[in-house]
């Protein structure tokens, strides 16, 4: 059996056939973050639940030390949602001779680390100014896209302020990836 | 032909091969909601268009009575967007001896119901405080992630306030799932 | 080998098997927008990077002149994020004899163009009122869903105000699609 037997009329050689059920996949869910030393000049990375509740890793996609490990090269859909919550933000107050202060903000970054490459690559970023007057606030940032990843790549989720992450429910803050 | 003939060098037995075009898939779009009886202590569920316009169900994925029915076990990507719109939110008014009142909020939950299990499972939640002063407001909440679902599971979308859902366009509020 | 050899017990004929690695896929990233003539009564379309950095097109999915070209009929997952940023928006100020003015808003639309059909089809829309008092603001709108597309369909991303799009980083504003 040759992979190209099923090529459409424009005659293209296919890669070997592959069953879907065995593809690397993971869905990780939020846990309470413990204070750790963060890398300088980098947003802190979240750590995750990988086997309880809705969380799972399968088919050689492993989770270790805040990272999802990519076990095989290919195109992956990668996604995350982080729900933030905070107390009142006074970003709209006029300070310093009438100049508005820099707004508070919340940011999520999905980052790829390749051991052979010195600098991490930011794959996805969601960033939002927060300017809520007179009350507590909460809101999610969702990200998702497809990337060509290499075996051995590592993925993590970084946030601008780990203390604002809502860790109370597995459906509010999560991180996942699957081979297409 | 054995599925594992195409196993990579780390030699793994694959599940049987499967054509992509026949996988269960659905994309449902918004319709105007009419007042109905909701389940007690649960956010109301939306009902959906399943065949007109952009909406479809295929390959044994069926829609009935607010639920998407999962016809076969496997890993599914499930997503929804709900666009909310409201007229004036007074959450920033200072009440009760200067204490701000609890902010208005909007919430979307994608819920799984398994007949053999008494309690529904919340798969995904997007929740956002709404604090808009002196004007109409509108905004979407988007959710999407991968879950291991079982044949017979049912999925629905619940919202905190059905009256705030923007039902006017099929591209603004939608719900879908597909087997990976 | 017949596709249906692997049919589950409910005996369904499958389409021919197909290797995943050869499916049409694209992930496009933001570039600085140059002023162009927009079609009347339609939001301006963004143009994109399709080969540098994280951007790619593969397996006959091509990008040309603001459009992603669908090379083969099937069900596609289509997604985009646009990050907007702007100066202070005074939409909450009470004007005109106490009437709040209509809020500023930001909108993203993923649009399908079919040459044989006169009107474009809006597949996805994310629209949000912006009412930030006394500071600059920035925020993303994310969209993603599955659609049945035909060979020759073209996809584009339209925005309500091209001058508010944050074009500074490839991870902030992007557009992609892949055959399921």
């Amino acid at each position: 059996l040759k992979g190209q037997e099923f090529a459409p009329s424009h005659q293209q050689v296919y890669a070997p056939l592959r069953a879907d059920g065995d593809k690397p996949r993971a869905h990780l869910t939020v846990v309470r973050q413990t204070p750790t030393q963060h890398l300088k000049n980098q947003f802190p990375a979240l750590h995750w639940e990988h086997e309880l509740g809705l969380a799972f890793t399968k088919n050689r996609m492993n989770y270790t030390n805040k990272f999802l490990l990519i076990p095989e090269s290919g195109d992956y859909f990668v996604y995350s949602q982080v729900t933030f919550r905070g107390m009142t933000s006074e970003c709209s107050e006029i300070r310093q001779a009438g100049r508005p202060n820099k707004p508070d903000s919340i940011t999520v970054v999905i980052t790829k680390v390749t051991d052979s490459y010195p600098e991490p690559t930011q794959l996805l970023m969601g960033t939002k100014s927060v300017c809520e007057v007179g009350s507590n606030w909460f809101q999610p940032i969702y990200l998702g896209a497809m990337f060509s990843l290499q075996e051995g790549d590592k993925l993590m989720v970084n946030v601008s302020d780990i203390s604002l992450v809502d860790y109370t429910k597995e459906d509010k803050t999560f991180f996942g990836a699957f081979l297409l | 032909l054995k599925g594992q003939e195409f196993a990579p060098s780390h030699q793994q037995v694959y599940a049987p091969l499967r054509a992509d075009g026949d996988k269960p898939r659905a994309h449902l779009t918004v319709v105007r909601q009419t007042p109905t009886q909701h389940l007690k202590n649960q956010f109301p569920a939306l009902h959906w268009e399943h065949e007109l316009g952009l909406a479809f169900t295929k390959n044994r994925m069926n829609y009935t009575n607010k639920f998407l029915l999962i016809p076969e076990s496997g890993d599914y990507f499930v997503y929804s967007q709900v666009t909310f719109r409201g007229m004036t939110s007074e959450c920033s008014e200072i009440r009760q001896a200067g204490r701000p009142n609890k902010p208005d909020s909007i919430t979307v939950v994608i819920t799984k119901v398994t007949d053999s299990y008494p309690e529904p499972t919340q798969l995904l939640m997007g929740t956002k405080s709404v604090c808009e002063v002196g004007s109409n407001w509108f905004q979407p909440i988007y959710l999407g992630a991968m879950f291991s679902l079982q044949e017979g599971d049912k999925l629905m979308v619940n919202v905190s306030d059905i009256s705030l859902v923007d039902y006017t366009k099929e591209d603004k509020t939608f719900f879908g799932a597909f087997l990976l | 080998l017949k596709g249906q050899e692997f049919a589950p017990s409910h005996q369904q004929v499958y389409a021919p098997l197909r290797a995943d690695g050869d499916k049409p896929r694209a992930h496009l990233t933001v570039v600085r927008q140059t002023p162009t003539q927009h079609l009347k009564n339609q939001f301006p379309a963004l143009h994109w990077e399709h080969e540098l950095g994280l951007a790619f097109t593969k397996n006959r999915m091509n990008y040309t002149n603001k459009f992603l070209l669908i090379p083969e009929s099937g069900d596609y997952f289509v997604y985009s994020q646009v990050t907007f940023r702007g100066m202070t928006s005074e939409c909450s100020e009470i004007r005109q004899a106490g009437r709040p003015n209509k809020p500023d808003s930001i909108t993203v639309v993923i649009t399908k163009v079919t040459d044989s059909y006169p009107e474009p089809t809006q597949l996805l829309m994310g629209t949000k009122s912006v009412c930030e008092v006394g500071s600059n603001w920035f925020q993303p709108i994310y969209l993603g869903a599955m659609f049945s597309l035909q060979e020759g369909d073209k996809l584009m991303v339209n925005v309500s105000d091209i001058s508010l799009v944050d074009y500074t980083k490839e991870d902030k504003t992007f557009f992609g699609a892949f055959l399921l």
Epitope: - | R32, Q33, T34, P35, T36, Q37, H38, P44, R85, G86, M87, T88, E90, D104, S135, N136, D161, I162, S163, L164, V165, Y167, T168 | P100, K102
Partner: antibody
């Protein structure tokens, strides 16, 4: 089926108050806004405001601010509209109405005639 | 507040005839417009929502169109039961406001 049943007609003196009730059945009362609309004899419809039965939050038209109070009792699925300091031009049929969205009311009560006369 | 101006205020028509009622908003209301029918001594009845969507159970001879500031309700072939007063209502912004009404009478 959805039903809104209002209290009976009232005759009031100027300066008095009236409280109209609206009992809901056939749907989840706390899930949908309740609007109040009035119609003076031979005149058009005038929207007064709404109440969110779930939270008790209200929004009143400026014209009625300080004179109208909308409340609800979720234990008996009933909304109330109280109008104080009645004047002769408050003589009208008062309707409660609800719907699946804020923008249009699918279901209306039968109306309550309030007559203000000295 | 947004003003809703309905015209004409009354119209005489025959059974089987076509009637068009217009409603103009004082500012852009997108498609947030509803049309109601009211018969004497009865509560209003929703006909059209979101400018052009027909409420369930309403005959297809009723249709709505328009967006922005100009809207139209059309009754394509008047039936005896259609003689009533018709109101438009905007729901783009608070407070909701109604048009003054159009009375459709038998010619």
């Amino acid at each position: 089926q959805v039903q809104l049943v209002q209290s009976g007609a009232e005759v009031k003196k100027p300066g008095a108050s009236v409280k109209v009730s609206c009992k809901a059945s056939g749907y989840t009362f706390t899930g949908y806004y309740m609007h109040w609309v009035r119609q003076a004899p031979g005149q058009g419809l005038e929207w007064m405001g709404w109440i969110k039965p779930k939270s008790g939050g209200t929004n009143y038209v400026q014209k009625f601010q300080g004179r109208v109070t909308m409340t609800r009792d979720t234990s008996i699925n009933t909304a109330y509209m109280e109008l104080n300091n009645l004047k002769s031009d408050d003589t009208a049929v008062y309707y409660c109405a609800t719907g699946g969205s804020q923008d249009a009311s699918d279901f209306w009560g039968q109306g309550t005639m309030v007559t203000v006369s000295s | 507040d947004i003003q809703m101006t309905q015209s004409p205020s009354s119209v005489s028509a025959s059974v089987g005839g076509r009637v068009t009622i217009t409603c103009r908003a004082s500012q852009d209301i997108s498609i947030w417009l509803a049309w109601y029918q009211q018969k004497p001594g009865k509560a209003p009845n929703l006909l059209i929502y979101a400018a052009s969507s027909l409420q369930s159970g309403v005959p297809s001879r009723f249709s709505g169109s328009g967006s922005g500031t100009d809207f139209t309700l059309t009754i394509s072939s008047l039936q005896p039961e259609d003689f009533a007063t018709y109101y438009c209502q905007q729901a783009d912004s608070f407070p909701l406001t109604f048009g003054g009404g159009t009375k459709v009478e038998i010619k």
